[in-house]
Interface confidence: low
């Protein structure tokens, strides 16, 4: 046997090259036949009326043919025949790969609430062989469940992902990535998660800057509430007491001028949106005003005063529960 050929794998629509090679040539006729055993080429003559077959090289030792715009129907065994005595035959198998025609991602809900489990489906249509689908949430790979449908040698793969969403997932892409021998690099489609979550509340003391509240001073607290959707209502209340009459509320800001001991207590900022509500507490303690020491007459005394600033904030980011998470900064 001195007639050789090689199997060919080609992507649909691209070019397949079939080569019939003769090791020890004696100028015998080389012929190429298709899977239906019709003659494509007899030496350099083409009986088959299919212009997609083009002669690349013809000699006594090689018949090399290109097949352009390959389709699924071209798949199968192609026969090289060498008309020696006795005749020799060798075959090459053309395998056609079809990349997925379309990659579609379908998300159960456009907007989800934190803690909710949503279903995401990705479909890779009409590929050959079947496509492998991988899921990523951002850079993290997730496990999906795939189903394969076969129709006329083509495969449609649908992968289902059940995803429990958290507030950190808001704006993160869910990526459906395809792996297929006909696809080089990454073929992927993605949808961005939109996750609604209840507010997170944080109180900041914007005045006095050093954090020590004394009688006669002013106090300014700013309430920062972040949620999705953005909290519709941010309110200040005084826990277990009325708000001082000289307190001024301006949006997220609470101003108390001319502090006195009766202002001592817990001030709560409450925020809510359609998902839930949360609050953060500020415990106000008003210190005595600084004492003025008269100038000495004969004796010199050095006095060292140590001041401790206490800023206590109690935060609760769980809807409808009493504050139990304490952040204390001494």
């Amino acid at each position: 046997q001195n007639l050789f050929t090689k199997d060919v794998t080609v992507i649909e629509g691209e070019v397949a090259t079939i080569s019939c090679q003769v090791n020890k040539s004696d100028d015998s006729v080389i012929q190429l036949l298709n899977p239906n055993r019709q003659t494509i080429y007899f030496r350099d003559f083409r009986p088959l009326k299919d212009s997609r077959f083009q002669l690349l090289n013809f000699s006594s030792s090689e018949l090399k043919v290109s097949l352009t715009n390959v389709s699924i129907s071209d798949e199968g065994r192609y026969f090289c025949q060498l008309y020696t005595d006795p005749p020799q035959e060798s075959y090459t198998t053309i395998t056609v790969l079809v990349p997925p025609r379309n990659l579609m991602i379908d998300i159960q809900k456009d907007t989800a609430v934190e803690g909710e489990e949503i279903e995401v489906n990705c479909t890779a249509m009409a590929s050959k062989p079947a496509t492998t689908i991988r899921w990523f949430k951002g850079n993290t790979e997730l496990k999906g469940k795939s189903e394969v449908e076969e129709w006329s040698d083509m495969y449609t793969v649908t992968s289902q992902l059940m995803l429990k969403v958290h507030k950190e997932d808001d704006g993160v892409p869910v990526i459906c990535q395809v792996e297929h021998p006909a696809v080089t690099g990454n073929l992927q489609t993605q949808r961005y998660l939109e996750v609604q979550y209840k507010p997170q509340v944080h109180i900041q003391m914007t005045y006095p800057l050093q954090g020590l509240t004394r009688e006669g001073d002013a106090l300014e607290l700013t309430c920062e509430a972040i949620g999705k959707p953005q909290p519709v209502m941010v309110t200040w209340v005084r826990v277990d007491d009325e708000m001082p009459q000289h307190a001024v509320l301006s949006g997220p800001n609470l101003f108390i001028n001319n502090l006195n001991k009766t202002d001592n207590g817990t001030y709560r900022c409450e925020a809510s949106n359609i998902v839930g509500k949360a609050h953060s507490d500020y415990m106000l303690y008003v210190y005595d005003p600084p004492t003025t020491i008269p100038p000495p007459t004969t004796t010199t005394t050095t006095t060292t005063t140590t001041t401790t600033t206490i800023l206590t904030i109690i935060t609760d980011s769980r809807a409808g529960e009493e504050g139990s998470i304490r952040a204390v900064d001494h």
Partner: antibody
Framework: QVQLQQSGTELAKPGASVKMSCKAS????????MHWVKQRPGQGLEWIGF????????EYNQKFKDKATLTADKSSSTAYIQLSSLTSEDSAVYYC????????????????WGQGTLVTVSA | DIVLTQSPASLAVSLGQRATISCKAS??????????MNWYQQKPGQPPKLLIY???NLESGIPARFSGSGSGTDFTLNIHPVEEEDAATYYC?????????FGGGTKLEIK
């Protein structure tokens, strides 16, 4: 062989819009992404974005997100770029370029280029 | 965005000598062993033409006097021996991440 034939020179007024075409031949149009690149006179090259003609999926360089709109017509194997709210900064040669990869790899190279369309914005 | 810095901005090389163009990326363009760096040649009034893809692969039809090397962040295009028809501007380009970016270009003049 792969060929990308671009439409002719455009002269436009500031504030106007312009739409250029890139007709592809010699390959299966829907299997390859089509990219667009800008080159101002005497300057370097800037990637505008790409379109997957099979799905209509587009991705833009953030810089051109509000300036360029990429579309494609599968039936005529033609890709389009529309530039809006034109200013003198948009005066440039715009190239379409077919990436040398199969079916949507994002890591590739510009294998084939159109001859370019010159856009001049002038009052 | 990944910034590609080419050097020199221009160079003049005698016929038959070697031209070396450098391209430095602001971050690595290597992924899974592949370098996503490409080189193009552009002559006045013409579109760019692919010379080298994936850092070191010569595009078919391009003369063997063109070669590319490098990995990670540092890449080089070599032309040897330089011929008159090589007078052009050369660009490096990364396809590691969007937005795809080009170097500022190196203008090669033949002495």
């Amino acid at each position: 062989q792969v060929q990308l034939q671009q439409s002719g020179t455009e002269l436009a007024k500031p504030g106007a819009s312009v739409k250029m075409s890139c007709k592809a031949s010699g390959y299966t149009f829907t299997h390859y992404w089509m990219h667009w690149v800008k080159q101002r006179p005497g300057q370097g090259l800037e990637w505008i974005g790409f379109i997957n003609p099979g799905t209509g999926y587009t991705e833009y360089n953030q810089k051109f997100k509000d300036k360029a709109t990429l579309t494609a017509d599968k039936s005529s194997s033609t890709a389009y770029i529309q530039l809006s709210s034109l200013t003198s900064e948009d005066s440039a040669v715009y190239y379409c370029s077919r990436a040398s990869y199969y079916s949507g790899s994002s890591h590739a190279w510009f294998g084939f280029w159109g001859q370019g369309t010159l856009v001049t914005v002038s009052a | 965005d990944i910034v590609l810095t080419q050097s020199p901005a221009s160079l003049a090389v005698s016929l038959g000598q070697r031209a070396t163009i450098s391209c430095k990326a602001s971050q690595s363009v290597n992924y899974d062993g592949d370098n996503y760096m490409n080189w193009y040649q552009q002559k006045p009034g013409q579109p760019p033409k692919l010379l080298i893809y994936a850092a070191s692969n010569l595009e078919s039809g391009i003369p063997a006097r063109f070669s590319g090397s490098g990995s990670g962040t540092d890449f080089t295009l070599n032309i040897h021996p330089v011929e008159e028809e090589d007078a052009a501007t050369y660009y490096c380009q990364q396809s590691y991440e969007d937005p795809w970016t080009f170097g500022g270009g190196t203008k090669l003049e033949i002495k």
